[in-house]
């Protein structure tokens, strides 16, 4: 014969524990039902009656099976430098993250405490290390043979186009200008963008070596804050 299935509430066998989605009520000394996510315990169980659960009220939630008397309050509305990436529902708390083009300059256990705009590399400088959710962009000077003519937190240094005859030589902040209508080949058809990271988990982007028509003398600016005068700017 199959073992008898006990219905909550029931007294557990000595030395045994309650089953999944049940908890041991010290007062009743019984195994009782937990409430599902999105609910809370309205009335605790007794020896003869099981837990009575009720739905969480607006702006409150429970994420796990539980027997809490009150649901948890959802966090405050997102600050103006943040966006809501997960709404407050009966089963999950609101999640706020820094808005696009910003990163978390100071993270705390409960989320991002301070968001800051990603550093923009100015003309003559390109992105050496892209920004992540928790780290700023690192800029580097464009090496000989490469340039960047934008103020951007995503553009890297691009190689100068190769000309049959050069009208104006390129420099760190300007592409070469050719005399003929079309260059023999262009290695830089358009601005190269580094994608904004979606998540920083397991993301360890290394700056990619950039093609150069001249010996590279590029260097990374310090890991810490790179001086704004050295190729980065504010918003």
């Amino acid at each position: 014969l199959p073992a008898q299935v006990a219905f909550t509430p029931y007294a557990p066998e000595p030395g045994s524990t309650c089953r999944l989605r049940e908890y041991y009520d010290q007062t009743a000394q019984m195994c009782c039902s937990k409430c599902s996510p999105g609910q809370h315990a309205k009335v605790f169980c007794t020896k003869t009656s099981d837990t009575v659960c009720d739905s969480c009220e607006d702006s409150t939630y429970t994420q796990l099976w539980n027997w809490v008397p009150e649901c948890l309050s959802c966090g405050s509305r997102c600050s103006s430098d943040q966006v809501e990436t997960q709404a407050c529902t009966r089963e999950q708390n609101r999640i706020c993250t820094c808005r696009p083009g910003w990163y978390c300059a100071l993270s705390k256990q409960e989320g991002c405490r301070l968001c800051a705009p990603l550093r923009k590399c100015r003309p003559g400088f390109g992105v050496a290390r892209p920004g992540t959710e928790t780290s700023d962009v690192v800029c580097k000077p464009c090496a000989p043979g490469t340039f960047s003519n934008t103020t951007s937190s995503t553009d890297i240094c691009r190689p100068h186009q190769i000309c049959n005859v050069v009208a104006i030589p390129g420099n760190a902040s300007m592409d070469a200008v050719c005399t003929s209508t079309s260059p023999t080949r262009s290695m830089a058809p358009g601005a190269v963008h580094l994608p904004q990271p979606v998540s920083t988990r397991s993301q360890h982007t290394q700056p990619t070596p950039e093609p150069s028509t001249a010996p590279s003398t590029s260097f990374l600016l310090p890991m810490g804050p790179s001086p704004p005068a050295e190729g980065s700017t504010g918003d």
Epitope: A105, L106, S107, R113, A116, D136
Partner: antibody, heavy 124, light 112 residues
């Protein structure tokens, strides 16, 4: 006890640079951030910028963005503020103050510890 | 940027009498973590600023209980229940809810 000790007064000519230091003691330096504030003679307080001593992340006031750099040396528990291309209106007392950081999990207090101030005079 | 305004800008008070300073922010200072990062600082003549109140109403250690802070959202008040001679100075409200941190213009408290 917890304190921030700043470097001495400086006199500079317009166009020059100045680097002010702020040495922390009595607490774990990398558990907090450092904020820099300045005060021109007879004026109010102006926030200059902030540096997370653990990560090196910075944020500067927009009007100073192109001229200021804040750094830390964790080996000596010292924060630095460098201001370049000095002008006469940069004449002020410069303060560093401790702010919360990634490791300060206790209650938030705000700018609870201040340096004594460093007078920077810009004059030709 | 969040703009902080203070009233009055000057407050001559009689010793032993109460004083009140108002501070208003151009937008709510409630952070998504539920905290409101509004502080009050005191600056006595010739001295660096000193933290009095943090997160609207919490007195910092060593601050006399005659100082109290209140408010919510965008409107905040610092009260001195009985002004003493050592309370002379300039009082600033400041927000650190988001970058850039901003100060009020300051309120000068002196004795009549």
């Amino acid at each position: 006890q917890v304190q921030l000790v700043q470097s001495g007064a400086e006199v500079r000519k317009p166009g020059a640079s100045v680097k002010v230091s702020c040495k922390a003691s009595g607490y774990t330096f990398t558990s907090y951030s450092v904020t820099w504030v300045r005060q021109a003679p007879g004026q109010g307080l102006e926030w200059m910028g902030w540096i997370n001593a653990f990560s090196g992340n910075t944020h500067y006031a927009q009007n100073l963005q192109d001229r200021v750099t804040m750094t830390t040396d964790t080996s000596t528990s010292t924060a630095y503020m460098e201001l370049r291309s000095l002008r006469s209106d940069d004449t002020a007392v410069y303060y560093c103050a401790r702010e919360e950081g990634s490791g300060s999990y206790e209650d938030y207090y705000g700018m609870d510890v201040w340096g004594q101030g460093t007078t920077v005079t810009v004059s030709s | 940027d969040i703009v902080m305004t203070q009233t009055p800008l000057s407050s001559p008070v009689t010793l032993g009498q109460p004083a009140s300073i108002s501070c208003r922010s151009s937008q709510s200072l409630v952070h998504s973590d539920g905290n409101t990062y509004l502080s009050w600082l005191q600056q006595r003549p010739g001295q660096p600023p000193r933290l009095l109140i943090y997160k609207i109403s919490n007195r910092f250690s060593g601050v006399p209980d005659r100082f109290s802070g209140s408010g919510a959202g965008t409107d905040f008040t610092l009260k001195i229940s009985r002004v003493e001679a050592e309370d002379v100075g300039v009082y600033y409200c400041m927000q650190t809810t988001q970058f850039p941190f901003t100060f009020g213009p300051g309120t000068k408290v002196d004795i009549k």
